[in-house]
Interface confidence: low
């Protein structure tokens, strides 16, 4: 008598979540008589998936009519596959008995479920940083299978390489999660920059998922300050301007001090954007020279985005302004450096 063979031709089958999986099994002989049963897993804890002989298995249907004579095809179809269905399935021949006696098992077919990763979610730093500093962005995506996945980071189309990526869990699982951190060095040009986390997976058919974050949420571009003085007007008033340039975000408060006393405070609002996304702001102060006997020390004090105030001071020389209309007088700059990096 020829020895019975239970043949599972495919070592593995991969199915997209939601689809149906066909698990093939044929036997080489109708003898001995006995049912075929399908199990997921091996050993004492195995799970019964289908029993040709009895039971109700709503998601499982036989491919061929098991009642048909000479049927040696005991393949099954499992509908509406989920990641929880992943595992190795065994087609097992039983010899008729009471109870039935397990005779022979097929080699097993590993069912892997291709589950799409969730849309990548990119989160940036909690606090803003300035140019030349490194900030971290995190990208997370969940629920995918199989485990193999590719995640790339881009900044303005250029791939980043200072990246640390982990896929969990390390062992076998029905589905996996990926978490990646990219370290990005900010430049003053980055207000309009964007980082993209791109996830490629077998389920996406070459159309990767992308999550984005704008560096505008992560960057602070400190302002440059420049104080200039216009020529004196006929009414002995000097127009002094404080130009605050190339800053981001817009949150900025400017205070004028005359000889250390607050003269006026202004808040920036509804400023037009520069091409690079930064803002400029100019504030004017009229100083009545004739009202002062001594030189006037003017300070333009700028507090940007909650950072320590930056000052630019200079003196208006009263002696340089006779009572008639004067010419252009350069302000004496006694302030801090024009480029304030904090």
């Amino acid at each position: 008598e020829e020895e019975l063979q239970v043949i599972q031709p495919e070592k593995s089958v991969s199915v997209a979540a939601g689809d149906s999986a066909t698990l093939n099994c044929t036997v080489s002989s109708l003898i001995p008589v006995g049912p075929i049963q399908w199990f997921r897993g091996a050993g004492p804890g195995r799970e019964l998936i289908y029993n040709l002989k009895e039971g109700h298995f709503p998601r499982v249907t036989p491919v061929s009519d098991p009642t048909k004579r000479n049927n040696m095809d005991f393949s099954i179809r499992i509908s509406n596959i989920t990641p929880a269905d992943a595992g190795t399935y065994y087609c097992v021949k039983f010899r008729k008995g009471s109870p039935d006696v397990e005779l022979k098992s097929g080699a097993g077919t590993e069912l892997s479920v291709r589950a799409k990763p969730s849309a990548p979610v990119v989160s940036g730093p909690a606090v803003r940083a300035t140019a030349e500093h490194t900030v971290s962005f995190t990208c997370e995506s969940h629920g995918f299978s199989p485990r193999d996945i590719t995640l790339k980071w881009f900044k303005n189309g250029n791939e980043l390489s200072d990246v640390q990526t982990n896929v969990d869990p390390a062992g076998k699982s029905v589905s996996y999660s990926i978490r990646s951190t990219a370290r990005v060095v900010l430049t003053r040009r980055d207000v309009h920059s964007q980082v993209i986390c791109e996830v490629a997976h077998v389920t996406l058919q070459g159309d990767p998922l992308r999550g984005t974050a704008n560096l505008s949420e992560a960057i602070r571009v400190p302002p440059f300050l420049e104080v200039t003085q216009q020529s004196m007007r006929a009414d002995n008033q000097v127009n002094v301007t404080c130009q605050v340039t190339k800053f981001y975000p817009q949150r900025l408060q400017l205070t004028w001090l005359e000889n250390g006393n607050v003269s006026r405070t202004e808040m920036a609002s509804a400023l037009p954007e520069n091409k690079d996304g930064t803002y400029n702001w100019t504030s004017w102060l009229l100083v009545n020279v004739s009202a002062h006997r001594d030189d006037v020390k003017l300070t333009c004090q700028v507090e940007h985005d909650g950072q320590p105030a930056v000052n630019k001071s200079f003196s208006v020389k009263v002696s340089a302004h006779p009572k008639e209309q004067g010419s252009n007088t350069a302000a004496e700059n006694t302030g801090t450096n024009e480029r304030n990096i904090y």
Partner: antibody, heavy 115, light 111 residues
């Protein structure tokens, strides 16, 4: 504060070379290192910048053949598929342009591509 | 990519002369001020003079000054000194990080 290049020399066409730029007196960790070359009797030509961290960018003509990396004290530039027109003095300089200009510069290292 | 054109390619001048060198960009440089000037003497590495179009680098004599914005820039040496005879290069930066281009250089020679 100085930069010292090394690694130049004679190389055959198609060959590769790795140039080093070592800093003394300061750290490279918070600055980019830029590479500039100068062919004999010619002007300066910007090659690329190795940014803070590991971000690198190169002039369009240099992409693919030139790559770079950096530690806190040394920057490297790998030159591959070298051609005779790559013969030049190669300078490194601290900085990445705009408000971080190239300063200081190394003394340069001569790369000669010839069979 | 941005292109930088320097003129003249050479200039002859005497000690004490006021010398003006120009640099023109094919498009506005980044921020209208991404322009630096470098001085190079034979057999030496370049030396930074001016950056951000008009900011004098540390240790550079005040006779050097830079001006200009957008596409047109000027380096002025108010009173030429013997040590100033050299080749001067401008370096302009476009909107892309890697778009940094030197001009062809201007050689300042003794008349």
């Amino acid at each position: 504060r100085q930069l010292v290049e090394s690694g130049g020399g004679l190389v055959q066409p198609g060959g590769s070379l790795r140039l080093s730029c070592t800093a003394s007196g300061f750290s490279l960790s918070s600055h980019g290192i830029s590479w500039v070359r100068q062919a004999p009797g010619k002007g300066l030509e910007y090659i690329g910048t190795i940014g803070t961290g590991v971000i690198t960018y190169f002039a369009s003509w240099a992409k693919g053949r030139f790559t770079g990396s950096k530690t806190s004290s040394t920057a490297y530039m790998e030159l591959s598929s070298l051609r005779s027109e790559d013969t030049a003095v190669y300078f490194c300089a601290r900085g990445s342009a705009w408000n971080d200009p190239f300063d200081p510069w190394g003394q340069g290292t001569l790369v000669t591509v010839s069979s | 990519d941005i292109e930088m054109t320097q003129s003249p390619s050479s200039v002859s001048a005497s000690v004490g002369d006021r010398v003006t060198l120009t640099c023109q960009a094919s498009q506005s440089v980044y921020g209208n001020n991404d322009l630096a000037w470098y001085q190079q003497k034979p057999g030496q590495a370049p030396k930074l003079l001016i950056y951000l179009a008009s900011t004098l680098a540390t240790g550079v004599p005040s006779r050097f000054s830079g001006s200009g914005s957008g596409t047109d820039f000027t380096l002025t040496i108010s009173s030429l000194q013997p040590e100033d005879f050299a080749t001067y290069y401008c370096l302009g930066g476009g909107d892309d990080e890697a778009d940094n281009v030197f001009g062809g250089g201007t050689k300042v020679e003794i008349k």
